[in-house]
């Protein structure tokens, strides 16, 4: 849960009560017991961007 | 150059109460969070408790949960351990240090340690 | 708690010797591994975090590798100031930072 008076994270990010931040849902894969990865659950990852056409 | 600085260590009786502090200096302390890290004589490392940066968030190694309180005071640029029921097992050299910028990742300054012996 | 478990527990080697400590998980840690040492009397001083990557202002004689469970630490060439105990931490089971039991490196 975000604390009060926080501006929302950005979308494929989510807030950290143990670092007072938006961290990177990305980083979950690789460490899933991070606070602010239930916030991650929650919402879905920014969507993917091909890196061509 | 950064410091930490830890006193408030000393003797105390089984059961009895002690407040470490530990004094930053020479860098910006609220964005960071702290912990306390500990090692019993002869023995190895030991983390204790861990501080968000505002202080709203704290965690504590089983062995302490109940007992021990950290908390920080950022104007004061000073880290506290509120350490109640003490038990022999807690004799230890106390140390202070500051966590990474990321997630839990590393200790990258520590102070000099503070004993505490608790003893009848 | 994740157990660390290091390996040896002492050492006994010359300057100049190449040291090798390993530390392994006892669960998968990804990269979550950081090397410190310590002399007697003073506070731990971080050598290596994320398993290889070396702390500013620590000599380039120090590496750290692995991934998964097993690390290692290596010092290419001892130097006199490098007698002291090693310690690998995880932290990747955060909150529950955990620390290895350490590694006495002697003179021989």
């Known amino acids: 849960e975000q604390a009060p008076g926080q501006a929302p994270c950005s979308r494929g990010s989510s807030w950290s009560a143990d670092l007072d931040k938006c961290m990177d849902c990305a980083s979950c894969r690789a460490r899933p017991h991070s606070d602010f990865c239930l916030g991650c659950a929650a919402a879905p990852p920014a969507p993917f961007r091909l890196l061509w056409p | 150059e950064v410091q930490l600085l830890e006193s408030g260590g000393g003797l105390v009786q089984p059961g009895g109460s002690l407040r470490l502090s530990c004094a930053a200096s020479?860098?910006?302390?609220?964005?960071?969070?702290m912990m306390w890290v500990r090692q019993a004589p002869g023995k190895g490392l030991e983390w204790v408790s861990y501080?968000?940066?505002?202080?709203?968030?704290?965690h504590y190694a089983d062995s302490v949960k109940g007992r021990f309180t950290i908390s920080r005071d950022n104007s004061k640029n000073t880290l506290y351990l509120q350490m109640n029921s003490l038990r022999a097992e807690d004799t230890a050299v106390y140390y202070c240090?500051?966590?990474?910028?990321?997630?839990?990742?590393?200790?990258?300054?520590w102070g000099q340690g503070t004993l505490v012996t608790v003893s009848s | 708690d994740i157990q660390m478990t290091q390996s040896p527990s002492s050492l006994s080697a010359s300057v100049g010797d190449r040291v090798t400590i390993t530390c392994r998980a006892s669960?998968?840690?990804?990269?979550?591994l950081n090397w410190y040492q310590q002399k007697p009397g003073k506070a731990p001083k971080l050598l290596i975090y994320?398993?290889?990557s070396l702390q500013s202002g620590v000599p380039s004689r120090f590496s750290g590798s692995g991934s998964g469970t097993d690390f290692t630490l290596t010092i290419s060439s001892l130097q006199p100031e490098d007698f002291a105990t090693y310690y690998c931490?995880?932290?990747?089971?955060?909150?529950?930072?955990?620390f290895g039991q350490g590694t006495k490196v002697e003179i021989k």
């Open positions: 240090a500051r966590g990474g910028d990321t997630y839990f990742d590393y200790f990258d300054y």
């Open positions: 020479g860098f910006t302390f609220s964005p960071y969070p």
């Open positions: 501080i968000s940066p505002s202080g709203g968030s704290t």
């Open positions: 669960q998968s840690i990804s990269s979550y």
């Open positions: 994320a398993a290889s």
């Open positions: 931490q995880q932290s990747y089971s955060t909150p529950g930072i955990t």
